[in-house]
Interface confidence: medium
């Protein structure tokens, strides 16, 4: 799996999308988990509705929401009021029994809010470093890293 980088600004919302083959994953619930360490577990943050037919309903856990377009094959995760410690490595997963298949590996980067001067002496502001190749701007900036970048250990 490639790893896709999504950038968001502290205090704002970040939307992460994970496309998948809707036929291959038909009937499967989805989840969003955080990779805590190189060989550590992928800790479940939030999962879609217990009833697969209701997967389109947004489910929240704290400031993180998940919703699944099962026909279009797009899982969407929203991180509301993004904070520095939300930055990290995550996975979109497709669940079947006690197993989980990785749909997408995601690196969330949190940029400082240019209008927040509390720690301005230490923070990086958007625009100070080179832009991503092939970046597209929506609610987030995302790009795919090269094959083999940011290896994830197997989900435990």
């Amino acid at each position: 799996h490639n790893t896709t980088v999504f950038q968001g600004v502290a205090g704002q919302s970040l939307q992460v999308s994970c496309p998948y083959d809707s036929m291959k994953h038909w009937g499967r619930r989805k989840a969003w988990c955080r990779q805590l360490g190189e060989k550590g577990p992928c800790q479940r943050v939030v999962s879609t509705h217990n009833l697969w037919l209701l997967s389109f309903l947004r489910r929240w856990n704290g400031s993180t929401a998940i919703t699944d377009d099962t026909l279009g094959g797009t899982l969407t995760i929203t991180l509301r009021n993004l904070q520095p410690h939300d930055a990290g490595l995550y996975q979109c997963q497709s669940l079947h029994g006690s197993e989980a298949d990785t749909l997408r590996k995601v690196l969330v980067e949190v940029l400082a809010d240019p209008l927040d001067h509390r720690d301005a002496g230490d923070l990086w502001f958007p625009g100070e470093s080179e832009s991503f190749e092939d970046a597209h701007v929506e609610h987030s900036i995302s790009r795919s890293l090269l094959e083999g970048e940011i290896p994830f250990p197997p989900t435990s």
């Epitope: 980088v5 950038q7 990779q35 805590l36 360490g37 190189e38 520095p84 410690h85 930055a87 990290g88 490595l89 690196l107 980067e109 949190v110 940029l111 400082a112 720690d119 230490d122 923070l123 990086w124 100070e128 470093s129 080179e130 991503f132 790009r143 890293l145 083999g148 970048e149 940011i150 290896p151």
Partner: antibody, heavy 122, light 106 residues
Amino acid sequence: EVQLVESGGGLVQPGRSMMLSCSASGFTFSNYHMAWVRQAPTTGLEWVASITTGSGNTYYRHSVKGRFTISRDNAKSTLYLQMDSLRSEDTASYYCARRWYGGYEGYYFDYWGQGVMVTVSS
Amino acid sequence: DIQMTQSPSLLSASVGDRVTLSCKAGQNVNNYLAWYQQKLGEAPKLLIYNANILQTGFPSRFSGTGSGTDFTLTISSLQPEDVATYFCQQYNSWTTFGGGTKLELK
């Protein structure tokens, strides 16, 4: 096996410059956030600077901002710390460290180099 | 900066003892806390992260507990090779380290 090897330390006069290097092996260097952490008998362990993967964002502690510059050369798997306008309070062992993904400047540091001593004195 | 206070600064214990090291944060750091082991003349090694997850390679006699402001590192049965200085680090808000606890054998 993950290995981080620092070089470039030594004795330097106040106001002068020094460059530290850290050669990384045993992992895909370009994939990881990296950092410099220093340790002095008086101040203990202090995070100094970090650089992210991907966008290469850089972060510094207040006391070194504008004087120190962290950079990386992914092709050479090498991390650098350019230290200018050095002060006596910068005297410490400097460690190159790999950091896990999170936060602005630092999450936890999962691998450290053996450290290199920097002494700022006239 | 969030101040991290470790106690005691020096701890003498015997082989086989159950050893408890304390780390207190000046404000809530949730579970964003790591412990490091540093042996004399060596670099620190990550021991525990996220307050209670043991880093691969360390024996199960090491464990971490706590959340918020009070954290504990426990060695269930002290071994000679555990002699070292132990540091805690918070990474909830920027990052700061404790002053360390030096653990020695009686």
